[in-house]
């Protein structure tokens, strides 16, 4: 098809060589078209927009993406030729950065239902450059965490070294939906909830004497539980004595609850105390038996092939530890009578 009638948009992706980051292109079809594909919902400023940049068809996957080879060859279907690029509805996701992503990307409706649809297409000229500006050493990450229940903010990586006063007007999207009220280089969140998690895109316009282009950055935002302030607690054993039968096998289980930590290195081990001596026991590996957003319950067993008279004089100690501190629970074996 003839792409000369497509509206054109120039985008710049400046990626950091230090971090993994993604990029997206929206099939931002032009407004004036009369077709069902290119019609956009008009919203009063008070309404919260819940539309994707392209809001034409009921089935948002009815969009075809192409890349225009620089040598003038015919347009190539993105899905067939580029494994690192994923089409999700009307958004194109670039999974890996690199200057080889530079080029012209064209999107248009799959189904041409009226004469108006022929010119209903967008050509996006994407320029990809590695970040060379060393003056901004502490630019915001492309992966940002928000602490559930607290105040937080999401910074636009390409503008994070500029003060709010210097910053140009920014257009923000969350999961492809325009956030019309957000215009600064930082989104402030008064109280963080689960639904704040997602893919955020920040755009701003940069111009020189010849042309203007959109500088875009993508931020993956996770909502996380705050690191625990508590040492782990032992859920089992509860009692400090255990009735046993001599000569019989015995398994004692130690179950401990560890609170969330971003860097998680739990310790759970058994050791034996016998008068002045104590030593760690080689026991089966610890395993997680329950895993939730807030805590991890880990179990480790000590197995005695048969309980001996000597075992009755010993103390079996479960030791658990996280970055905050440690807890122990000791068990003394007692012979069952009768």
């Amino acid at each position: 098809f003839n792409i000369s009638g497509c509206s054109t948009k120039k985008l710049l992706w400046t990626y950091s060589t230090r971090s993994e980051e993604e990029f997206v292109l929206f099939c931002d079809l032009p407004e004036p078209q009369k077709s069902h594909f290119c019609h956009r919902n008009r919203l009063s400023p008070k309404q919260v927009p819940e539309h994707l940049p392209f809001m034409g068809s009921n089935d948002l996957s009815d969009v075809q993406w192409y890349q225009q080879p620089s040598n003038g060859d015919p347009l190539e279907d993105i899905r067939k030729s580029y494994p690192h690029i994923i089409q999700d509805k009307c958004t194109l996701h670039f999974l890996t950065p690199g200057v080889n992503n530079s080029g012209s990307y064209i999107c248009r409706p799959k189904m041409i239902k009226s004469p108006y649809d022929v010119a209903c297409c967008v050509k996006m000229i994407l320029e990809v450059k590695p970040q060379t500006n060393a003056s901004c050493e502490y630019s915001a990450s492309h992966k940002q965490d928000l602490l559930l229940g607290s105040t937080g903010s999401i910074s636009c990586p390409s503008l994070s070294c500029q003060s709010d006063a210097q910053s140009p007007a920014v257009t923000w999207y969350k999961n492809g939906k325009l956030l019309s009220v957000e215009r600064s280089n930082r989104i402030v969140v008064d109280e963080v909830y689960d639904y704040h998690q997602g893919t955020y895109v920040c755009d701003y316009t940069q111009s020189d004497t010849v042309s203007s282009w959109t500088v875009r950055a993508v931020v993956q935002v996770r909502t996380i539980v705050g690191d625990t302030k508590l040492k782990p607690d032992i859920l089992d054993p509860v009692e400090d004595t255990l009735e046993v039968e001599l000569g019989k096998p015995l398994t004692i289980s130690c179950k401990a609850r560890f609170g969330f930590e971003r860097v998680f290195n739990p310790v759970i081990k058994w050791y034996i105390k016998d008068s002045d001596l104590e030593w760690e026991v080689s026991v089966p590996e610890a395993k997680s038996i329950k895993s939730t957003l807030k805590d991890e319950i880990i179990e480790r067993n000590i197995i005695l092939e048969k309980v001996t008279q000597r075992d009755l004089r010993r103390k079996f100690v479960c030791f658990v530890q996280n970055s905050i501190g440690n807890t122990t629970q000791s068990v003394q074996l007692k012979e069952k009578r009768g």
């Epitope: 998680f264 739990p266 759970i268 395993k287 895993s291 991890e296 880990i298």
Partner: nanobody
Framework: EVQLVESGGGLVQPGGSLRLSCAAS????????MGWFRQAPGKERERVAS???????TYADSVEGRFTISQDNAKNTLYLQMNSLRPEDTAVYYC??????????WGQGTLVTVSS
Amino acid sequence: EVQLVESGGGLVQPGGSLRLSCAASGFTYIPAYMGWFRQAPGKERERVASIKTDASTTYADSVEGRFTISQDNAKNTLYLQMNSLRPEDTAVYYCAAYQFGAFRVWGQGTLVTVSS
């Protein structure tokens, strides 16, 4: 530092077999679940199979009866035995560990190509 490293990917003919391995290091315990995921060109990442600490397993419908997940705790290794491979199984395969209610620890992936 916890780390997962996949290996065993490669080019195989339709109907052939491959065995993927995932070496886990830095873990002080066995996670509640370990899983294999895959991402085919132009598609979203999908869960292929997962295994619990009690050795119970679950599989995606598309691989049920053809793929087998297993783990060797002594070697800290997770496996995916893939038989009767089809062209549609072509993807990058990722190993993942479940921590605090989600698959949070990921390997870098290994490419499996099924083609004649």
